[in-house]
């Protein structure tokens, strides 16, 4: 008779499981960006140091009343569900409150950076065990706030952010919309998005996953045994600012973008009910529910990927969109996605040392989605090899030509305008191995990765028949790093991953007037880590 | 996740010379100014100013003060509320909006964003 | 129904360690619904709560007991008990175990006690 | 500490009457008080939680009133065996209880 929330993201071999680092003891610490704590609270009570940060503004309204219960109900219940003794996910982990939201909720972003940037010193201070912060606020997109985020992210500290309540895109929100913060939406026990009245839990590309997020029972400020639910993003950010907290305690050098890849790959995949959102961000959104991640000891040396789609591009004839993996990860390949179908392709480029994913509009689109495909491969050396466009008529063959590098991605970009002209690309797995090929007027992309142990292979599914897309799947043990769809039918609206799904979606006029012989085939790169064999293209 | 959201972005390239500084003529903004796109969210009358990455720890301070000083000229006076040294170059300041485009044409400034609410979630 | 039993030694010596256990049948200890509590009422005077424990084994004291009691929990045996250190005729009093609603399950209502067991005297003399 | 101030000590009333037993907070306690009837040679009963709310199987003659820092017992009719020791006990900082007020027969 545990709480819902804990039960779904506590899998039945953790439940008794105290997390602890190798040493004994827990020395992970959470800071609380929030409104002020009720520390004497029983769930919290010698877990929590309020500190005499307070950067808040003036509440609203000459009749509001100081009820101190009140003003301390928000940050109360969230240290609670972080590290509550019997309500929390890390339980008895030690938690900073830093008030930068007053009695009614309301904070500054300028007030938000002194409180990150609190944090930041006191870091440089007493430098001490893992940090995670946790970010349960909202407001309008701040450039600054993610810059602030980013700055912190990069000196190794965690930060969790809530996706926001507005029932909207969650790049529209900072510090949601910060690429270096892990951003997380709301379901409820029905693995379904929160609704709050007329508005719920935000979506879109810039959230990373879902977490518990209503009727969330934990600490209430209303007395220090009192317990009581909440809803929101927030009480989801803290759900995972805990899970966070565990797998550091049992693991504190794993980094952030471990800690993301892992929470990604061990969440509850495709219970989410899309339909919730709009259709336009359906694709964009992420199916994943979060769980708490066994230790890497168990579950050894997997090839992690995670999706990483970029902004819209905008309709403009020259338009590009770009989409970047994190600092640590490899960029695999490359892919990209237009509702209209007219695109110009996708390629991988270099841009201040970064491999990035590009994707180009064609005159009279809508715009177009760049879709990295963005992995942790261990002592990686990647690189791009690319061809220019043949002459008509002729195929551009791409292939990994150093010795022990394997194709994990295959990109193509087309210097004509018209469409109806080009013939599409194909990759080919039977006649020649580890190739991309590329038809008229198509630049191929081929991303060629060495790295100990790394072994990949192709995997095609076709459809004849109308169908609006055509997926493929990696089986068990290998992880998808690359994704694109080799058309039969002129128009095809791109392909991209959803976790280790290839889709390859097709227009609809396409279908309609396709011949049989002409199959759409969705083709995926398939790789694996065996970090004891050597480097190998798989037939 | 990094390309800016639904927000106003605004250049404010004004007159060089409008101060009759020597200095200042030779400095044309290329900062910009950012506000949320929430209207109601905005909390006009304090900004952030955000001065370039590899801004020296002295050089912010003399950044704030010549705001400070430039704005005394004109009749204006400013507070400067929080010097920022570890996360990001920049300060925070409580000035009239008249006083932007002066902001904008300091040397090291990169952007200056109004400040606005964040809510519990 | 849910009873409540507490055995131990009537009778301790100043200095010594108390040491209580209540039986609880009719239910499980383990349910995340209640705390399990010990009260306890010197003869003629009023009742005073010393502290509580969970499940899990997460404890909450009196703070003025706080230094001179530990509770434990034995989820196989569906017990819980008490250890109050250095006691001193102070600690004379009917020691009770109650059950305490969590309020971590909201089902479970709100945190009051009950029901109690019958108590057991306990007194401190030499 | 929330000291909880009980009055009367002792109530002599006849079956039949009203009993108003009070009790006084040293600082508020919201709604977060409740009271136990206790009898001789007996463990305490829970009568009223959450300062008004009956609890299961408690007569409704018993009702409770108040909130901050004073609080009210009533006893509309006392039946015989309603001649105790009452306790209130408040939860709004950690658990502490009322010095007790007797209702003895007249």
């Known amino acids: 008779s545990i709480p819902w929330n804990l039960e779904r993201i506590i899998p039945a071999w953790h439940q008794t499981e105290e997390d602890r680092s190798p040493d004994g003891s827990s020395q992970v610490e959470v800071y609380l960006l929030d409104t002020s704590i009720q520390g004497a609270h029983r769930e919290i009570e010698g877990r929590v140091t309020i500190t005499d940060f307070n950067s808040v503004p003036e509440e609203d309204g000459t009749r509001f009343h100081r009820q101190a219960s009140k003003c301390d109900s928000h940050g109360t219940h969230l240290a609670g569900v972080v590290s509550g003794r019997d309500a929390g996910v890390a339980k008895g982990t030690s938690l900073h409150s830093l008030r930068v939201l007053n009695c009614q909720g309301k904070g500054t972003v300028s007030g938000t950076l002194i409180g990150l940037e609190f944090i930041r010193k006191s870091q440089l201070i007493q430098p001490s065990g893992p940090l995670v912060v946790l970010l349960p606020l909202a407001g309008g997109y701040s450039r600054i706030l993610n810059a602030a985020c980013r700055h912190l992210a990069r000196t190794g500290v965690v930060l969790v952010a809530a996706a926001g309540n507005f029932r909207d895109d969650a790049c529209l929100y900072s510090p949601a919309s910060a690429p270096e913060v892990i951003t997380v939406g709301a379901t409820n026990a029905q693995d379904q998005p929160v609704t709050l009245g007329t508005l719920g839990t935000n979506f879109g590309r810039c959230v990373d996953l879902f977490a518990p997020g209503k009727d969330i029972i934990g600490a209430s400020s209303d007395c220090s045994t009192c317990f009581m639910s909440q809803s929101g993003t927030s009480q989801a950010a803290a759900h995972v600012a805990g899970i966070v907290a565990r797998m550091l305690s049992r693991e504190p050098t794993l980094t952030l973008a471990e800690l993301r890849q892992r929470l990604i790959h061990f969440s509850t995949k495709d219970v989410i009910n899309m339909a919730w959102f709009p259709e336009d961000q359906q694709v964009l959104t992420p199916n994943l529910v979060a769980t708490l991640p066994p230790s890497t000891h168990e579950t050894g040396g997997q090839l992690l990927c995670r999706t990483v789609w970029s902004a819209h591009s905008g309709p403009t004839r020259t338009a590009t969109a770009t989409a970047r993996c994190a600092p640590e990860e490899e960029l695999l390949s490359c892919s990209s996605f237009s509702r209209s179908g007219r695109r110009r392709g996708d390629w991988i480029e270099a841009i201040g040392g970064q491999q990035v994913c590009k994707a180009l509009n064609a005159f009279g689109g809508e715009g177009v989605y760049a879709v990295a495909r963005c992995c942790l491969v261990p002592r990686a050396n990647c690189s791009i090899h690319n061809t220019p466009a043949a002459r008509a008529g002729l195929e551009t063959h791409v292939h990994c030509h150093q010795k022990d590098h394997v194709l994990t991605g295959c990109s193509f970009h087309w210097e004509v305008e018209d469409l109806s002209v080009r013939r599409q690309p194909a990759l080919r797995s039977r006649r020649q191995p580890g190739q991309c090929v590329g038809h008229q007027a198509a630049s191929v992309y081929a991303s060629c990765c060495h790295a100990p142990g790394l072994e990949c292979k192709i995997k095609e599914h076709g459809i004849s028949g109308p169908s609006e897309q055509v997926t493929v799947a990696c089986e068990a043990g290998w992880t998808l790093t690359g994704c694109n769809v080799l058309p039969g039918a002129s128009l095809t609206l791109g392909a991209y991953s959803v976790d280790n799904l290839c889709v390859a979606r097709v227009h609809d006029t396409a279908r309609a007037d396709r011949t049989s012989g002409e199959a759409t085939v969705a083709a995926a790169i398939c790789c694996r880590s065996r970090p004891s064999a050597k480097a190998s293209w798989v037939q | 996740q990094d390309e800016d959201g639904d927000y106003e972005e605004l250049m404010l390239a004004l007159p060089s010379q409008e101060d009759g500084l020597a200095d200042e003529a030779a400095h044309v903004a290329t900062a910009t100014f950012r506000r949320c796109s929430k209207e109601a969210w905005r909390l006009p009358g304090t900004y952030i100013v955000v001065l370039m990455e590899e801004t020296q720890r002295l050089q912010i301070e003399q950044t704030a003060h010549r705001l400070q000083t430039r704005a005394a000229r004109r009749g204006y006076v400013i507070k400067v509320l929080h010097i920022f040294y570890d996360l990001f170059p920049g300060f925070l300041v409580k000035m009239s909006s008249d006083l932007l485009g002066l902001a904008l044409k300091l040397p090291h400034v990169e952007y200056i964003e109004e400040d606005s609410f964040v809510f519990a979630q | 129904q849910l009873q409540l039993q507490e055995s131990g030694p009537g009778l301790v010596k100043p200095s010594e360690t108390l040491s209580l256990t209540c039986t609880v049948s009719?239910?499980?200890?383990?349910?995340?619904?209640?705390?399990w509590g010990w009260i306890r009422q010197p003869p003629g005077k009023g009742l005073e709560w010393i502290g509580s424990?969970?499940?899990?084994?997460?404890?909450y004291y009196n703070p003025f007991l706080k230094s001179r009691v530990t509770i434990s929990v034995d989820t196989s045996k569906n017990q819980f008990s008490l250890k109050l250190s250095s006691v001193t005729a102070a600690d004379t009093a009917v020691y009770y175990c109650?059950?305490?609603?969590?309020?971590?399950?909201?089902?479970?209502?709100?945190?009051?006690?009950?029901?109690w067991g019958q108590g057991t005297l306990v007194t401190v003399s030499s | 500490e929330i000291v909880l101030t009980q009055s009367p000590a002792t109530l002599s009333l006849s079956p039949g009457e009203r009993a108003t037993l009070s009790c006084r907070a040293s600082?508020?306690?919201?709604?977060?008080l409740a009271w136990y009837q206790q009898k001789p040679g007996q463990a305490p009963r829970l009568l009223i939680y959450?300062?008004?709310n009956r609890a299961t199987g408690i007569p409704a003659r018993f009702s409770g009133s108040g909130s901050g820092t004073d609080f009210t017992l009533t006893i509309s009719s006392l039946e015989p065996e309603d001649f105790a020791v009452y306790y209130c006990?408040?939860?709004?900082?950690?658990?502490?209880f009322g010095g007790g007020t007797k209702v003895e027969i007249k």
């Open positions: 009719g239910g499980s200890i383990s349910s995340s619904s209640y705390y």
């Open positions: 109650a059950r305490e609603n969590s309020g971590v399950v909201p089902a479970a209502g709100p945190n009051w006690f009950g029901p």
């Open positions: 424990i969970y499940y899990s084994g997460s404890t």
């Open positions: 600082q508020s306690v919201s709604s977060y």
């Open positions: 959450d300062a008004s």
């Open positions: 006990q408040q939860r709004r900082n950690w658990f502490t």
